[in-house]
């Protein structure tokens, strides 16, 4: 069953390589367990960046070595991706699955274009 997922069209990463955006889903039912996956699309290749499953009322926890962190509030997930470099510029797609209770719902956003600009190295000072 399809579900609408909204996310911003464009986000500019900070000079420290951190990008944040909100992924909002229109829950058709009473979702109590949700899985959020961030996918990166570049050159027609799609790769999984990170994923987390969370129960409503519980914190959103990604794996320890994940480049993502996040918080949830109602039907919104605030996602932060860190450690980005210019080569990571691309379309970051938010995929939301309502895992429990049944029925299962899937929603995929249109993607957020994240632009990452590597900071200029500081000139040597004598």
């Amino acid at each position: 069953k399809a579900m609408h997922v909204a996310q911003p069209a464009v986000v500019l990463a900070s000079s420290r390589g951190i990008a944040s955006f909100v992924c909002e889903y229109a829950s058709p039912g009473k979702a109590t367990e949700v899985r959020v996956t961030v996918l990166r699309q570049a050159d027609s290749q799609v790769t999984e960046v990170c994923a987390a499953t969370y129960m409503m009322g519980n914190e959103l926890t990604f794996l320890d070595d994940s480049i993502c962190t996040g918080t949830s509030s109602g039907n919104q997930v605030n996602l932060t991706i860190q450690g980005l470099r210019a080569m990571d510029t691309g379309l970051y797609i938010c995929k939301v699955e309502l895992m429990y209770p049944p029925p299962y719902y899937l929603g995929i956003g249109n993607g957020t274009q994240i632009y990452v600009i590597d900071p200029e190295p500081c000139p040597d000072s004598d």
Epitope: M56, G57, M99, P103, Y104
Partner: antibody
Framework: QVQLVQSGAEVKKPGASVKVSCKAS????????INWVRQAPGQGLEWMGD????????NSNQKFEGRVTMTRDTSISTAYMELSRLRSDDTAVYYC?????????????WGQGTLVTVSS | DIVMTQSPLSLPVTPGEPASISCRSS???????????LYWYLQKPGQSPQLLIY???NLASGVPDRFSSSGSGTDFTLKISRVEAEDVGVYYC?????????FGGGTKLEIK
Amino acid sequence: QVQLVQSGAEVKKPGASVKVSCKASGYKFTDHFINWVRQAPGQGLEWMGDINPNNGGTNSNQKFEGRVTMTRDTSISTAYMELSRLRSDDTAVYYCARLRREYFYAMDYWGQGTLVTVSS
Amino acid sequence: DIVMTQSPLSLPVTPGEPASISCRSSKSLLHSNGITYLYWYLQKPGQSPQLLIYQMSNLASGVPDRFSSSGSGTDFTLKISRVEAEDVGVYYCAQNLELPLTFGGGTKLEIK
């Protein structure tokens, strides 16, 4: 090891209420949904509802017409199921069961059951 | 509600022989995500139910590999390759494609 320990047998009169408890141990209580299932004597299994221990959110079987209330106390890792306006056909063994997401929300651990007898 | 229908009601089996239990759902349990939301539980005499199979064909931890399950969207079969005395009890199929979760009426496996 994971354990769900339920309260003891109850005998109730028609029209009364019963509250069954389910104490969890051996895992983090707030990480798993708790379901309630009942079994009338010699009969099959009937799902009553579930509770999210984090925020207390519930889903219940409409068959119970609002007679079932599920709550929890996270401080003592215990879930409760209260059934009101009892009728003789509510006589059954009531089970709590833990859901496991790795098993696609199957009930992987069950309590020992609580026999509730409704009789005048 | 999705109705789960099991057959036979009772199944007498000789130890060492195979056994087969059928379950039919009133609606396809195969979701478009590729998952079949069908489960099997066993309730041994005087005990609480225990999980055998999840997602139609996956054995739960600790379940002997003499158990297997297969099926389509609506017709499912639980097979025991060689029945042992400890396998006696009532077998239930169940669905969690949608609420309310529903169970089959049960099949009682007994030793001849």
